[in-house]
Amino acid sequence: MMTGTIETTGNISAEKGGSIILQCHLSSTTAQVTQVNWEQQDQLLAICNADLGWHISPSFKDRVAPGPGLGLTLQSLTVNDTGEYFCIYHTYPDGTYTGRIFLEVLESSVAEHGARFQIP
């Protein structure tokens, strides 16, 4: 039975040219996290494997920094970065947990962080 919940940074906005930290947190389970995948729509951004560390997709290497923790920092944001991002937690023995973040990259300086929410 999967008892865990994923907490994410929810709906967030950031300024063009700036950076943003994407974060998910898995709680309420004692399952071991074996790998976390970060994806943008159907495109793999990064993998954080418990035995092998980080792998950043070559096309994002220059503007993605791993961390803090299992999070991911997107740098030099463009309007094209607007969209859905997913953190996919692979765990044992629970299986897979997925969290969703929506990022809006704004031209202006009115970007504000959205509230946190939980995905059961």
Epitope: H25, C48, L52, G53, W54, I56, G69
Partner: antibody, heavy 117, light 107 residues
């Protein structure tokens, strides 16, 4: 086997600079952060900052900006920390430690720095 | 910055006792809390990751719990080799921070 081998004990004068090294073996240095941690005699642990050799990203504790400079040479599987404008407060043991998202799981043996005139 | 406060500063116990060490965060850090052991004149060693996840090679008598701001490291039946310093560390946000430590000593 993962190992982090740090350079040896340093004795330096106030105002001088020192550069210490941390040679990684047994894993790919480009897949992990290399953090540096300070420990004064009889004191706790203090995070200085980290370098991610995969793309040379760095993060610093604000307290150590201007004091510490973190770099890495991937071809040599080695991370470096340079400390400048040394004072007595910089006398400490400095550890390098790797982190791949799941805690700081391997540590070097530490480099002891003594600043004395 | 996230401030981590550990208590007690010193804990005097007899081998065979079971003990709990506390780490409290100044703000919520979910479960992004790790525990380390440091024996005298040695480098720190990772004991528990993400509040409660075990580490290969670490004896099962060490366990962790907590989420949000309050965390606990438990040692079930302390052995003589367990005496030393224990530190918590958060990876929720930059800069990473450590707690001030708890010294586990023989009574």
């Amino acid at each position: 086997e993962v190992q982090l081998q740090q350079s040896g004990t340093v004795l330096a004068r106030p105002g001088a600079s020192v550069k210490m090294s941390c040679k990684a073996s047994g894993y790919s240095i480009t897949s992990y952060w290399m953090h540096w941690v300070k420990q004064r005699p009889g004191q706790g642990l203090e995070w200085i900052g980290g370098v991610y050799p995969g793309n040379s990203n760095t993060n610093y504790n604000q307290k150590f900006k201007g004091k510490a400079k973190l770099t890495a040479v991937t071809s040599a599987s080695t991370a470096y920390m340079e400390l400048s404008s040394l004072t007595n407060e910089d006398s400490a043991v400095y550890y390098c430690t790797r982190e791949g998202g799941y805690g700081m799981d391997y540590w070097g043996q530490g480099t002891s720095v003594t600043v004395s005139s | 910055d996230v401030v981590l406060t550990q208590s007690p500063a010193t804990l005097s116990v007899t081998p065979g006792d079971s003990v709990s060490l506390s780490c409290r965060a100044s703000q919520t850090i979910s479960n992004n809390l790790h525990w380390y052991q440091q024996k005298s004149h040695e480098s720190p060693r990772l004991l528990i990751k993400y509040s409660s996840q075990s580490i290969s090679g670490i004896p099962s008598r060490f366990s962790g719990s907590g989420s949000g701001t309050d965390f606990t490291l438990s040692i079930n039946s302390v052995e003589t080799e367990d005496f030393g310093m224990y530190f918590c560390q958060q990876s929720y946000s930059w800069p990473y921070t450590f707690g001030g430590g708890t010294k586990l000593e023989i009574k």
